[in-house]
């Protein structure tokens, strides 16, 4: 028995930040779980982790240097990533493990979300206009 995960196929981070919502076919209310976001086709980089516990505040952290936050819904976890770099454009996968109460459950691998990070476009200053067209 596996949890199904739905993600947007593609998101664009215009200002180097993005909200990625992971929607689950499972109600997380009163469960102890570990939701995580992984970068790359092989999910090699664990971008962000959200620990949910029935009795404690949500714990959100990244061990890989990403600036992330997380919000919990009954059947979703939303990861808010900031300060993304253009070279972090990649496919990102949501993962969920429900530990307590038993039985342990995890998810079928989702299709992932391509996050396209657009660099900040610096507008030319009026005092120093860009090169004019001939």
């Amino acid at each position: 028995n596996k949890i199904l995960v739905k993600q947007s196929p593609m998101l664009v981070a215009y200002d180097n930040a993005v909200n990625l919502s992971c929607k689950y076919s499972y109600n997380l209310f009163s469960r102890e779980f570990r939701a995580s976001l992984h970068k790359g086709l092989d999910s090699a980089v664990e971008v962000c982790v959200v620990y949910g516990n029935y009795s404690q505040q949500l714990q959100v952290y990244s061990k890989t240097g990403f600036n992330c936050d997380g919000k919990l819904g009954n059947e979703s976890v939303t990861f808010y990533l900031q300060n993304l770099y253009v070279n972090q454009t990649d496919i990102y996968f949501c993962k969920i493990e429900v530990m307590y109460p038993p039985p342990y459950l995890d998810n079928e691998k989702s299709n992932g979300t391509i996050i396209h990070v657009k660099g900040k476009h610096l507008c030319p200053s009026p005092l120093f206009p860009g090169p004019s067209k001939p």
Partner: antibody, heavy 120, light 111 residues
């Protein structure tokens, strides 16, 4: 046949660290369906759960020990490890690893245990 | 944390006696009709051995004189006819929530 064999116990100085091993055979630590916990028992006392590791590598720890404990594994050796830091006399105990299945989480197989004595 | 309180802490009994040990949880350990409460036997110098899982299911290879019952917060381990090899310490354990917790143990001694 499922077997768990702990090693690495002995005499440790207060303030020191310990690293215990639990070699598993008869099942794979990285295959879905089973996880392994560390449990300890001080001399003449009851059983205390330390923490656990799932097939995915995710870990869960007892809040009372969380700041001092790390559970890890080496899939190539099918071996589990327990690292406990800043040891004190109260950490003197027999340390067991025990396997659980994902449905009920009961401990169906246990190692023989390894004794750790914290003393100067 | 879920506290488990066993009673009695120790008891003296004779071979052939019916022995009952109780375990009370500080909150329900039931979920979807399953009680996540297990019983173990431990002999001196040995690792614990699983006897009963999910409150009432007998672990493979365990003699049928051992039985478990209960749900919610109140559980019982019964040995219908005590045998010489049953003198040991018995523990209950819950796996409903983390941290997993054990009862303090009940020592069954020879009268």
């Amino acid at each position: 046949e499922v077997q768990l064999v702990e090693s690495g116990g002995g005499l440790v100085q207060p303030g020191g660290s310990l690293r215990l091993s639990c070699a598993a055979s008869g099942f794979s630590l990285s295959t879905g369906g089973v996880g392994v916990s560390w449990i300890r028992q001080a001399p003449g006392k009851g059983l205390e759960w330390i923490g656990e590791i799932y097939h995915s590598g995710s870990t869960y720890y007892s809040p009372s020990l969380k700041s001092r404990v790390t559970i890890s594994r080496d899939n190539s050796k099918n071996t589990l490890y327990l690292q406990l830091n800043s040891l004190r006399a109260e950490d003197t105990a027999v340390y067991y690893c025990a396997r659980y299945e994902y449905y009920h989480y009961d401990f169906d197989y246990w190692g023989q245990g390894t004794l750790v004595t914290v003393s100067s | 944390d879920i506290q488990l309180t066993q009673s009695p802490s120790s008891l003296s009994a004779s071979v052939g006696d019916r022995v009952t040990i109780t375990c009370r949880a500080s909150q329900s350990v039931d979920f979807h009709g399953i009680s996540f409460l297990h019983w173990y036997q431990q002999k001196p110098g040995k690792a614990p051995k699983l006897l009963i899982y999910a409150a009432s299911s007998l672990q493979s290879g365990v003699p049928s004189r051992f039985s478990g019952s209960g749900s919610g917060t109140d559980f019982t381990l019964t040995i219908s006819s005590l045998q010489p090899e049953d003198f040991a310490t018995y523990y209950c354990q819950q796996s409903y929530r983390s941290p997993r917790t054990f009862g303090q143990g009940t020592k069954v001694e020879i009268k």
